[in-house]
């Protein structure tokens, strides 16, 4: 009679984490008498996975009824596969012996690889806001995937970015892997509504990549432009001066009027006008009683935006001349040292 062969038909199988893996094994003869055992690995360090005769293997079930007299199928099913189950599994026939069974023949082995999905990518931006023309870094992380091969792309408003660096860890063997990527993005004044997207593609996702997003509204600070203008006279001794605060983001802004360097009024921006690009405009006005001044008046509009150092614009109001509309001076004036820092609300 032909000598028994142990046949493991599958050289390799791939199973998704959480599913069951079926490891096929058949023998070609009922002789010699003796049990089948399954091992992960070979040599002296191999691990027993299933023993037909003894032991408790809660995750392992046999595919066919091993108690049947003529059974030659010793396939097993391992439930709830995790990446830690990866390895080469050997079906080994033992010959009945005393006191111990004697290894008779091994199958060629079945390599089990485990597919595990990457976690949803998490995109994080810089801790502090940055202004247009500055380059900021975004990071994207995803974990727990297997096998190691993975593709990561960056987009800004649908346009693919090229300035990024990606690492997959660990470099060596692991049951699962992590990816970490850092992208550099140059901010523009129009980026309040922009999004940065990190896209991860992996064999387990069947062509439907995972995406993580970050809104540049969390990252960008667009500083305001200021314009101070004198309006036509409202009454004989009163002049209306307005400070137009344009194109700023985020909303948090505090404005202080100074007359000849002395604080006249402080107000926090409210009832803002939103522009199409997501920035805001705001206007503040000051009614100046010209008759209360003997000399010319220097009016300064000082704006503290989002906790940044104050910016200001000044306007010279001529008192000596008969009250009439004055031209505006839009040359930037220095932030006044006499003005105490003011915490805005927004």
């Amino acid at each position: 009679e032909e000598e028994l062969q142990v046949i493991q038909p599958d050289k390799s199988i791939s199973v998704a984490a959480g599913e069951s893996a079926t490891l096929h094994c058949t023998v070609t003869s009922l002789i010699p008498v003796g049990p089948i055992q399954w091992f992960r690995g070979a040599g002296p360090g191999r691990e027993l996975i299933y023993n037909q005769k003894e032991g408790h293997f809660p995750r392992v079930t046999t595919v066919s009824d091993l108690t049947k007299r003529n059974n030659m199928d010793f396939s097993i099913r391992i439930s709830n596969i995790t990446p830690a189950d990866a390895g080469t599994y050997y079906c080994v026939k033992f010959r009945k012996g005393s006191p111990d069974h004697v290894e008779f023949k091994s199958g060629a082995g079945t390599e089990l690889s485990v597919r595990a999905k990457p976690s949803a990518p998490v995109v994080s931006g810089p801790a502090a806001r940055a202004t247009p023309q500055h380059t900021v870094s975004f990071t994207c992380e995803s974990h727990g995937f297997s096998p190691r091969d993975i593709t990561l792309k960056w987009f800004k408003n649908g346009n693919e970015l090229s300035d990024f660096q990606t690492n997959v860890d660990p470099a060596g063997d692991s049951v699962s892997y992590s990816i970490h990527s850092t992208a550099k993005v140059v901010l523009t004044r129009e980026d309040v509504h922009s999004q940065v997207i990190c896209e991860v593609a992996h064999v387990t996702l069947q062509g439907d990549p995972l995406r993580g997003t970050a809104n540049l509204s969390e990252t960008i600070r667009v500083p305001p432009t200021l314009e101070v203008t004198q309006q036509p006279v409202r009454a004989e001794n009163q002049v209306n001066v307005t400070c137009q605060v344009r194109k700023f983001y985020p909303q948090r802004l505090q404005l202080t009027w100074l007359e000849n360097g002395n604080v006249s009024r402080t107000e926090t921006a409210s009832t803002l006008t939103e522009n199409k690009d997501g920035t805001y405009n705001w206007m503040s006005w000051l009614l100046v009683n010209v008759s209360a001044h003997r000399d010319d008046v220097k009016l300064t509009c000082q704006v503290e935006h989002d906790g940044q150092p104050a910016v200001s614009k000044s306007h010279d109001l001529k008192v000596s001349a008969h009250p009439k509309e004055q031209g505006s001076n839009t040359a930037p004036g220095p932030a006044l040292a006499s003005a105490a820092p003011l915490g805005g609300s927004g």
Epitope: A42, P44, G87, E103, F104, S106
Partner: antibody
């Protein structure tokens, strides 16, 4: 193809600990045994021990009390530590890969590092 | 431990001629699965050992077919059908059946 590179100090003082690392490049740690073998000057080969990819270790009984082999799969490295060294531990130390795919035995030490000379001297 | 004994200690050879090295083990290396767990290695001068034969008779990848291994149980032989100049060095047998793995003392092959 797979390459192994030993690294560590070439000189160790008597009674101190010898520490060597072997870096595996161009291949996987999985499914292999990772071995340390030494060769004293002008003498034959002596097996120190090995570690399987699943972390199981096997040591030469003559050295077992002084030897620890560990595996860092994430770095594709394995290491040898030998305590209380004496001049008799002076040797070329090789790291090597051992195959296993047929039952309880081993199927050849098929990849070797180039060896690193360790001298034990004060 | 399994003791491995090699002979001869030294083997002067003539290029183109055959050569033979013997290795004996203190216990059988034939496992119940039918494999004999014995390896042969060649260590050329100044180099690391190189695997020639595993499981007694299987040639390792890239090894020229002039090298062959035979034997079973406790007696094993490495044959070189036609020695070449590059074959000089020390040949070692090693049992791979059980730990500790043990080597023979080596056979130094040199050109006459």
């Amino acid at each position: 193809q797979v390459q192994l590179q030993e690294s560590g100090p070439g000189l160790v003082r008597p009674s101190e600990t010898l520490s060597l690392t072997c870096t595996v490049s161009g291949g996987s740690i999985r499914n292999y045994y990772w071995s340390w073998i030494r060769q004293p000057p002008g003498k034959g080969l002596e097996w120190i021990g090995f570690i399987y990819y699943n972390g199981r270790t096997f040591y030469n009984p003559s050295l077992k009390s002084r030897v620890t082999i560990s595996l860092d799969k994430s770095k594709n490295q394995f290491s040898l530590k030998m305590t209380s060294v004496t001049a008799a531990d002076t040797a070329v130390y090789y790291c090597a890969r051992v195959r296993a795919y047929s039952g309880i035995g081993l199927d050849g030490t098929d990849v070797w590092g180039q060896g690193t000379t360790v001298t034990v001297s004060s | 431990d399994i003791v491995m004994t090699q002979s001869p200690l030294s083997l002067p050879v003539t290029p183109g001629e055959p050569a033979s090295i013997s290795c004996k083990s203190s216990q059988s290396l034939l496992y119940s699965n039918g494999y004999a767990y014995l390896d042969w290695y060649l260590q050329r001068p100044g180099q690391s050992p190189q695997l020639l034969i595993y499981q007694g008779s299987n040639r390792a990848s890239g090894v020229p077919d002039r090298f062959s291994g035979s034997g079973s149980g406790t007696d094993f032989t490495l044959k070189i059908s036609r020695v070449e100049a590059e074959d000089v060095g020390v040949f070692y047998c090693m049992q791979a059946l059980q730990t500790p793995l043990t080597f023979g003392g080596g056979t130094k092959v040199e050109i006459k």
